[in-house]
């Protein structure tokens, strides 16, 4: 009710002999600040002197004495809310009730607190969860229901009596509430901490013990087994017995149900602790364990390998790669099953025995044709030898060998032949599927490689095939060797090496360009005229009657070629000239009388000069001198030169009679 | 193109001893066997000798075991076989052949020489 003061603290502390007591504690006083405080120990009331009676250990007046007790106690607090007090050091006579009397000024309270103090330090208490299972982390508390300022304490944890590596929270709380030690320690037992007994120990601060606590761990754990095998290294040898046995070395709780297992798969009907296999066939090799069970779950023993031993299995080759290009590199592998692993193997290419080749694979580092074939092979171990299996065929590829480019015409070759070649090869892998010819041309191939070249020409000189499958192989080229006439017959002027004129010295060559076979003949006609048979035709002085219309000819044994006419050109002075009178040399006055000066020339006059019977040269210079009309005057005798860029020629003396008319004749 | 040629065959006394040499050309690998099978007339071909040019590792047959050495000159490309010890039954034709591989028989044949005549009177 309101008429009570308001205490708060821990209803009973706990401590022993020597020890201290902390006694958190708060209040509040129904008026005013507190006036005088006493502490008693067992206090007890007086009806009589209606005060209490009892051991004063702490006393606090308004004149301020105090007894010298009050050096062991302490009244830590204040006038209106702390209360705390101190005993140090605390005594087994101290345990009992402790009264704080508290006077303010018009009112009073006796406020009582109970003190447990034990001859010996108390154990501290062990606290443990309800189930404990293997590798679950779990966390152990202990905990003791004292702490004290003036007196520390630790808590340490043991196993088996030795200290836990794990690390411990230590926590203290001195509050009104509670007073305590503990100490908090994460554990993740396992199944071999099953019995085990963990300790808590309290101890001072030098760490001399003081006093214990002790619990027995209880882990739930799956069944621990070992598997025992006869014979011990679990190898044998088909046809062979094996017992296995599996041992339960701890189980919690009982186990319940056993089996086998066989690579992880259960084996059907086994469920004894003895594992009995008899007459062991090689299907039997593999890793055998024991499962037991109970309600935790199943455990599992260690696996145990049993080999059973047998000779070598019937191999197989593998080839990486087939098929192999030629020049690169392969490699066999042989297979075969065997326990232990073969030791030795024998090689057979084309059912041969390999020598020094008796690894399991055999690398061939620049595969040849050659290596082709089936590749088989043994191996062998301690128990026999297997048998050879059917083998892998290693098949090499290459471009076509040894390829020729063969003539199948009679030889020579004439020029407009039809000719037949073919392309021949040795050997290919895969088969050729085409040709190819060099150069190209405009020709059949009646055949897979048959070329035929229709009217072959004169210049085909050398051809060549390739027969092809994935790769390409050129033959070398072959010489055609056509022969054919000769060809580019041509006349040419060697000398001289300018125009010729009449009186030089003349040669013309016949020249051609090329012929097969080499061996020829010349001849030289003007006019359908032979004319000689070498490779040059002279003239010691070329006169105009030599020129014309010259042809050479070249024959070999194929044909004969002629050139082109060739026009020989002699150049001259003007000759011959004469003067021609038209309409006559006589010629009645009045009349027209044309005098014509005609020459030969090469090239042709360019230039004429008229000359009378005086030598008198006349105003005209054309070829023709016309006199119009005519006069008796002009009788008399003319001549004409001709001029070219030659020379000069002149005519000799024509004369010309002009006869007086009738008309003049009747006028006399 | 393999070609093998061989030399050094003749007439010799029995105890005697020969030197057959074997010139190869045209082998484009580094590693296959070259070695000597011998022919004498109305007989079955018979390995002699052979040998891996990849590591020089050498074979013979029991008949000539002890007696026959087989060995190479690189810079020659020729391989010798030597005949110590000869007896009337060695007679016969000696031929070079090279191939992939040494086999029991003597060295696969793919390639092999003329031949060369061994002939060892008594």
């Known amino acids: 009710d309101s008429s009570k003061w308001v205490f708060e603290h821990p209803e009973t502390l706990y401590a022993w002999e020597g020890a201290c007591v902390w006694i958190p504690c708060t209040y509040r006083a129904l008026d005013g600040d507190l006036e005088s405080f006493i502490l008693f120990h067992n206090p007890e009331y007086n009806k009589n002197t209606s005060k209490f009676d009892g051991t004063r250990l702490y006393e606090s007046t308004k004149d301020g004495k105090v007894p010298s007790e009050q050096k062991r106690v302490q009244f830590l607090g204040d006038k209106n809310k702390n209360c705390t007090l101190s005993i140090h050091p605390v005594h087994l006579n101290d345990s009992g009730q402790l009264g704080l009397r508290m006077e303010s000024k018009t009112e009073k309270w006796m406020e009582r607190i109970h003190l447990n103090v034990s001859e010996r330090p108390f154990p501290p208490h062990i606290q443990l969860p309800p189930e404990i299972q293997e590798s679950q982390e779990v966390t152990l508390t202990c905990l003791l229901n004292f702490s004290c300022y003036g007196y520390p304490i630790q808590l340490q944890w043991l196993l088996e009596g030795v200290p836990m590596r794990q690390a411990a929270v230590t926590s203290t709380s001195l509050t009104i509430k509670s007073v305590f030690t503990r100490s908090e320690l994460k554990f993740s037992p396992q199944w071999s901490h099953h019995g085990k007994i963990v300790t808590c120990q309290l101890q001072d601060a030098d760490g001399k013990f003081l006093s214990n606590d002790t619990v027995q761990l209880n882990v739930k754990h799956t069944p621990k087994l070992e598997i025992k095998v006869t014979p011990s290294d679990a190898i044998v040898r088909e046809g062979d017995s094996v017992t296995m046995t599996c041992e339960v070395s701890s189980s919690n709780p009982e186990y319940t149900t056993v089996s086998w297992l066989k690579d992880g798969t259960s084996l059907k009907k086994q469920n004894t602790f003895t594992l009995n296999l008899r007459e062991v066939t090689k299907d039997q090799s593999g890793k055998y364990c024991c499962q037991v069970s109970n309600d935790v779950g199943p455990g599992r023993s260690e696996e145990v390998f049993l080999q059973v031993q047998y000779a070598p299995e019937p191999s197989t080759v593998q080839i990486l790669h087939s098929p192999a290009v030629e020049g690169s590199q392969v490699e066999f592998l042989c297979m075969s099953l065997a326990n232990p692993l073969p030791t030795n193997y024998t090689w057979y290419h084309n059912g041969k025995e390999m020598q020094g080749r008796t690894e399991e694979k055999v690398h061939i580092p620049k595969i040849l044709p050659w290596h082709a074939g089936t590749y088989s092979c043994v191996a062998e171990n301690i128990l026999g030898t297997g048998q050879r299996g059917p083998g892998a065929e290693l098949d090499v590829q290459y471009p076509p060998k040894k390829v020729t480019t063969v003539i199948q015409n009679p030889m020579p070759i004439r020029e407009g032949d039809t000719v037949t070649l073919s392309c021949n090869y040795n050997s290919s892998n895969p088969s050729v599927t085409r040709y190819e010819w060099k150069p190209h041309g405009a020709w059949e191939e009646p055949s897979l490689g048959v070329l035929k070249i229709q009217n072959v020409g004169w210049d085909n000189t050398t051809i060549a095939c390739a027969a092809c499958n994935s790769w390409c192989s050129w033959a070398s080229p072959v010489a055609l060797n056509v022969q054919y006439a000769p060809r580019d017959v041509r006349v040419r002027k060697i000398k001289p090496l300018s125009e010729i004129h009449s009186g030089n010295s003349v040669s013309l060559q016949c020249d051609f360009s090329s012929s097969h076979p080499k061996e020829v003949q010349f001849f030289w006609e003007k006019n359908g005229r032979l004319l000689g048979k070498e490779s040059q035709l002279n003239f010691d002085s070329i006169s105009p009657e030599d020129a014309g219309s010259y042809s050479c000819w070249v024959n070999n044994s194929i044909g004969q070629t002629a050139s082109k006419a060739w026009t020989l050109e002699v150049l001259y002075a003007p000759r011959r000239l004469r003067v021609s009178m038209s309409p006559g040399d006589q010629v009645m006055e009045g009349k027209s009388a044309t005098l014509t000066c005609e020459s030969d020339a090469n090239p042709p006059v360019s230039h004429y000069t008229w000359f009378d019977w005086n030598n008198q040269s006349l105003p005209y210079h054309s070829q023709k001198l016309r006199l119009e009309p005519v006069k008796v005057q002009h009788s008399g005798a003319y001549w004409c030169q001709g001029t070219n860029s030659v020379g000069k020629g002149r005519s000799p003396l024509s004369t010309l009679t002009v006869y007086y008319s009738p008309e003049t004749i009747g006028r006399r | 193109q393999v070609q093998l040629v061989e030399s050094g065959g003749g007439l010799v006394q029995a105890g005697g001893s020969l030197r057959l040499s074997c010139a190869a050309s045209?082998?484009?690998?580094?590693?296959?066997?070259i070695g000597w099978f011998r022919q004498a007339p109305g007989k079955e071909r018979e390995g002699v000798s052979c040998?891996?040019?990849?590591?020089?590792?050498?074979y013979y047959a029991d008949s000539v075991k002890g007696r026959f050495t087989i060995s190479r000159d690189n810079a020659k490309n020729t391989v010798y076989l030597q005949m110590n010890s000869l007896r009337p039954e060695d007679t016969a034709v000696y031929h070079c052949?090279?191939?992939?591989?040494?086999?029991?028989?003597?060295?696969?044949?793919?390639?092999w020489g003329q031949g060369t005549q061994v002939t060892v009177s008594s």
């Open positions: 040998m891996y040019s990849s590591d020089g590792s050498t």
């Open positions: 052949a090279a191939g992939p591989w040494c086999f029991v028989t003597g060295v696969g044949r793919e390639e």
């Open positions: 045209g082998i484009t690998s580094d590693d296959y066997a």
